[in-house]
């Protein structure tokens, strides 16, 4: 049996501040159930960026349609990017439960972000 | 054209034991959650089960009781249904799940159901 | 565990009148309701999922709409083929997924 496969294709992405930056990643499969997060860095230290039901992220926006069926593209948009988003984004699958258990990450993109044109 | 046929119904008495399956064809089966749902005879529809990939989830009152778990190399779901009572006589639908967006899981495609009677 | 009231339990309508179901959730959903058809001796049918979304080949006539812990189905115009218990769904918090006690639409 193939196993879940979480897909960031892009090792780094780099965009202008001010822009936006799409972040893109995929799943190999719509099960086991649970959702996808979206964090920055890595360990216990790391920021959530976007997960669909709790929080409010209003720079966040995930690209593919909300109402689409059987969505496996969770890649997300982020809008009026600064300096200080820079970092490495990582897509993360949770199995469901109580409390979800993460089950895998991508392997990240680095978002490197320059100046401005003048 | 996605189809799902149950089988294993029947008639069993208390305490006794019975397997259904569900064969499903026309889509994807193996990357899709699926699930039962059963309905007491003259009554409204509640859930039973739902099968993952090896994650698994029950309804309070069959869990200890019931077991999922699904065949992909045969596009089979199988539940398992030990110390059965009088009160999971129903008929019983097996269901594939959808996802919409981000979000949770609901039920697009349903078998014809099969019917257990549990009774002495 | 969400608990989800429909009212009301039983409608008499006449064909081409406009038919108002109502779903409430003991807790928000967000928009995490689906609603189903079934007519005696069938299968569940999925009609709107995601409160207001129409699923392939559902006929326009049928609709969606609400968030949070209020949700509505509407028939437009009720066709004699649209008899049959609907009830909804909520997937927002589960285990376990939890339906309403349906409503029973009869023709008059």
């Known amino acids: 049996e193939e196993e879940l496969q979480v897909i960031q294709p892009e090792k780094s992405v780099s965009v202008a501040a001010g822009d936006s930056a799409t972040l893109n990643c995929t799943v190999s499969s719509l099960i086991p159930v649970g959702p996808i997060q979206w964090f920055r860095g890595a360990g216990p230290g790391r920021e959530l960026i976007y997960n669909l039901k709790e929080g409010h992220f209003p720079r966040v926006t995930p690209v593919s349609d909300p109402t689409k069926r059987n969505n496996m593209d969770f890649s997300i948009r982020i809008s009026n990017i600064t300096p200080a988003d820079a970092g490495t984004y990582y897509c993360v699958k949770f199995r469901k439960g109580s409390p979800d258990v993460e089950l895998k990450s991508g392997a990240g993109t680095e978002l490197s972000v320059r100046a401005k044109p003048s | 054209e996605v189809q799902l046929v149950e089988s294993g119904g029947g008639v069993v008495q208390p305490g006794g034991s019975l397997r259904l399956s569900c064969a499903a064809s026309g889509f994807s089966f193996s990357i899709y959650a699926v699930s039962w749902v059963r309905q007491a005879p003259g009554k409204g529809l509640e859930w039973v089960s739902t099968?993952?990939?090896?994650?698994?989830y029950y309804a309070d009152s069959v869990k200890g009781r019931f077991t999922i778990s699904r065949d992909n190399s045969k596009n089979t779901l199988y539940l398992q249904m030990n110390s059965l009572r009088a009160e999971d006589t129903a008929v019983y639908y097996c269901a594939k799940d959808s996802t919409v967006g981000w979000s949770g899981d609901f039920f697009d495609y349903w078998g014809q159901g099969t019917l257990v009677t549990v009774s002495s | 565990e969400i608990v989800l009231t429909q009212s009301p339990a039983t409608l008499s309508v006449s064909p081409g009148e406009r038919v108002t179901l109502s779903c409430r959730a003991s807790q928000n959903v967000r928009s995490d309701i689906a609603w189903y058809q079934q007519k005696p001796g069938q299968a569940p049918r999925l009609l709107i999922y995601a409160a207001s979304s129409r699923d392939t080949g559902i006929p326009a006539r049928f609709s969606g709409s609400g968030s949070g812990t209020d949700f509505t189905l509407t028939i437009s115009s009720l066709q004699s083929e649209d008899f049959g218990v609907y009830y909804c769904q909520q997937y927002y918090d589960w285990p376990p997924f939890t339906f309403g006690g349906g409503t029973k639409v009869e023709i008059k």
């Open positions: 099968i993952g990939a090896d994650d698994t």
